[in-house]
Structure formats: C-alpha cells, structure tokens
Interface confidence: low
Amino acid sequence: GITIPRNPGCPNSEDKNFPRTVMVNLNIHNRNTNTNPKRSSDYYNRSTSPWNLHRNEDPERYPSVIWEAKCRHLGCINADGNVDYHMNSVPIQQEILVLRREPPHCPNSFRLEKILVSVGCTCVTPIVHHVA
Amino acid sequence: GITIPRNPGCPNSEDKNFPRTVMVNLNIHNRNTNTNPKRSSDYYNRSTSPWNLHRNEDPERYPSVIWEAKCRHLGCINADGNVDYHMNSVPIQQEILVLRREPPHCPNSFRLEKILVSVGCTCVTPIVHHVA
C-alpha cells in the first residue's frame, strides 16, 4: 500500500505509549453543507414503522445530547392506517464514537467511547419460529 | 442547576482560546458489551425497504472505514414480494462525529468533524403534491 509521509508540521506526541493520547481540535468542521437540514425531519411520522425521538443527555459526554429513536409499535402501519402485527417495527442501530470526559469533570481531557444508538425504525418480515 | 466542580486531577489546558484543543485517549471504551453483535445484521434484507451496505474508506479519518446504506428500491416491498411504488424507500440519515487528521497525515493531531451517514432505510408514505 501507499505510505503517506508524516507531515513535518505535526505537533509532537505527548505520550508515545498506549493508551495513545492525541490532540483534538473541538471546533467542529461540518461536511454537510450541501444537505437539506430538513432532510429526514418527518420520516419518523411518515414511516410504516414510525418512531419517537427521546433525548439522552450526559454532561460528561461530547456531544452531551444524543437523540434515541424508539419504535412506536410492535407491528407496522398498513395501508388502512392500522397496526399490522404480521410485520415488525425494529430499530436500526448504529455504533457511534463519542468523547467521554476522563478523568470525570475535566474540561480538556477525554477518552473515545463507542456507544450504540437507535437512529430510526424499519419494518421487517418477522422470523417465524415453527413449533416442531 | 447543578454545577459539577472541576476535577483537580485534570491535565492543564494547552490552549485557552477557541478553536479549543483537548487531549483524547484513543483507546476506545466500548459500552455495548451486552448487545447482540448480530443485532440488525439481517434487517437490511428483511426490511420492506431493503438496503445494501457500501464501504467508505478514508485513511485521513478516524474511524477510517464507515459503512453507508443505499436503498435498493425507490418503492417498498409489498406482501406479495413486489415493489410497490405507492410507497417510498428512504435513507435514515444521522450526523456522526469523526476525527479528521489535521494537519493532514499527522498521526497524533485531529479535528472533530461532523458527517452525514445513511444508516438504513425505512418505508414512508410519499408526500403528494396536488396540482392546483
């Protein structure tokens, strides 16, 4: 593979040992400049597997606020607007990276943490377990 | 509100100005120890709005590999297994934080970046625009 040479303008590493500590600039760069901010704002209501968004706040985490999706129904909404229990609403989950203050309550020291969040719901055909 | 005192064992901040630079330990702590690793592994196939997962790799980003969902159909799969174009498959998108090497190619200096990823797809009722 291609080896990219180290940039000579890099800051010196404070800690050469693992656990590896790096410098991170918290001034967020947003790559989503050309996206519609309303991109999926109403999917949670229009979906056949609708969901509600619940606020999860933790001041020791960055970002401190994360929104969690909870499916409204066990089944899915059919064409008549009723819940069809022959199908299942299930959460689509994703592992995301967050920063956890470490040691606790420190304003400028963090540890990377992987957490599982539910982003929305989708309607799936259930797995039927036949009784032998 | 409750003010949590600063931990006296915190490292000193290198830079008191914005953009704020912090120390981050890259030894990831995984909070998802009790989750099923197959939690949604087959939803992409069983969903009425199925999707494929595409690999997005960028060595200047941490994590360097991100999986992007692409909906397979414009419509949704009905009870007969056919695509129903009265409904729409749409991607559920989420803004996530990643670390971008800055300056480029530096092993120990990053900047937080917000990117938009498609996690999966859901089936929605289309918005019908009536012609006046």
């Epitope: 901010p37 309303k38 704002s41 109403d42 209501n45 229009r46 609708p50 509600n52 968004l53 619940h54 606020r55 706040e57 401190s64 606020v65 409204r72 909404i77 607007g81 | 509100g1």
Partner: antibody
C-alpha cells in the same frame, strides 16, 4: 433551573411592528427547539411558531405566516419573534417555551403582553 | 389542519375522580404524542402529562393520561381531587409541521 424571560411586549398600532425576545438560562440553549405560544385575553392557548435547535428549520401557524419571523441567537441564548403587520387579533400574552421534543412545550416563561390597538 | 375538541368545563367534588376528554378531528391521534397542560389563573401553563401518559417529575401520580385509538381521543384523569387542581386544562398534539392546542377545559373543584 430552566429560566425563560420574555421581553419586548407593549402597545402598538395596527400595521405596526414589534420584536419579542426570550432570554434563556439554566440549560444548553442550542440543544433545544423553542416555540412561541400566545393567549388572547380570556381565551385559550394558540401555538404561533417553532424553531429547531440550530435555527435551520422554522415553523409557523397559518394565522401568522408571512407576518411573523422566529429566529434565535445561540451565542446569546436568546429567542426572538419579529412581528410585522400587526392586527388587533394578535393582542395576547406571548409565551416562550422550551420544547422537550417537537411539539411538546416542556418549560414556559411567564409571558409578555402585546396589545394592538389604535 | 386538524382540531382538538375538549369539553368547555367539568366540575367534581374533592376526593373524587374526573376525566377530561380531547378528540382529534382528523389524522390518527395514535400517530402523534398528546400532551396536557395545566394553567392556574394569572400563571403560565405547566406540563402535567407528555407523550400520552408520561408524568414530568414533580407532577403527582393522581394525574394520568391515556389514548383511545378507536375514538381518536385522549383523556386526562385526575383522581383524589384537591382544591388546588382547579385550573384550565389544555390538551395539545401536533403533526410534522404544526402544533395544535385544544380549546381548554375549566375544571371546578366544588
């Protein structure tokens, strides 16, 4: 403790303009959607407008669309409502509210009175 | 837009139970959360029930909320009535672009 303090109300003539402000404290302002709700004297509550935490999405009741503009300055923890082309029926106490989720006003200010009269 | 219809007034004696209804005119009530707000004279509203049946901290368990999909209506039930419960009560719901309040119900504790 969540605190919302409205200001900017007063007496204005029909056709005039007024700008309401809501100073927020006790929470991370930019993380919350915010709303304006009004109440005419002796009447019920009427939702006026809402804005997302980032300010990127705004929503209005049909009765004020095109006349009122909601905005926010997250650096100042302040919500605004610019009211133009005011009518007598806009006379009300205007409340600023912090949303729990979209459409759910969790915390309310004490309100500011707007009177539109000649 | 849809409407939310509430009875203009209800009255009951202390210690009893009272139920206030809220009917949605169009669109499924079950698809959107219903909230209930209490407003005492001269004060700002406060939320007593959110997300159909959830009570914020500090609201006594005498207050409960429910929805009935078959009648497309929501209900606020207050048990063991106290004189301090005398107030106006508003139901509220929404759709993706608009928020709607009911006309309000004046609760008198006799």
């Amino acid at each position: 403790e969540v605190q919302l303090l409205e200001s900017g109300g007063g007496l204005v003539q029909p056709g005039g303009s007024l700008r309401l402000s809501c100073a927020a404290s006790g929470f991370t302002f930019s993380s919350y959607a915010m709303s304006w709700v009004r109440q005419a004297p002796g009447k019920g509550l009427e939702w006026v407008s809402a804005i997302s935490g980032s300010g990127g999405s705004t929503y209005y009741a049909d009765s004020v669309k095109g006349r009122f503009t909601i905005s926010r300055d997250n650096s100042k923890n302040t919500l605004y409502l610019q009211m133009n082309s005011l009518r007598a029926e806009d006379t009300a106490v205007y409340y600023c509210a912090r949303d729990l989720i979209w459409g759910v006003a969790g915390s309310w200010g004490q309100g500011t009175m707007v009177t539109v009269s000649s | 837009n849809f409407m939310l219809t509430q009875p203009h007034s209800v009255s009951e004696s202390p210690g009893k139970t009272v139920t206030i209804s809220c009917t949605r005119s169009s669109g499924s009530l079950a698809n959107y959360y219903v909230q209930w707000y209490q407003q005492r004279p001269g004060s700002a509203p406060t939320i007593v029930i959110f997300a159909n049946n959830q009570r914020p901290s500090g609201v006594p368990d005498r207050f409960s909320g429910s929805i009935d999909s078959s009648s497309n209506s929501a209900s606020l039930t207050i048990s063991r009535l106290k004189t301090e419960d005398e107030a106006d009560y508003y139901c509220q719901s929404y759709d993706p672009r608009v928020v709607v309040f009911g006309g309000g119900t004046k609760l008198t504790v006799l």
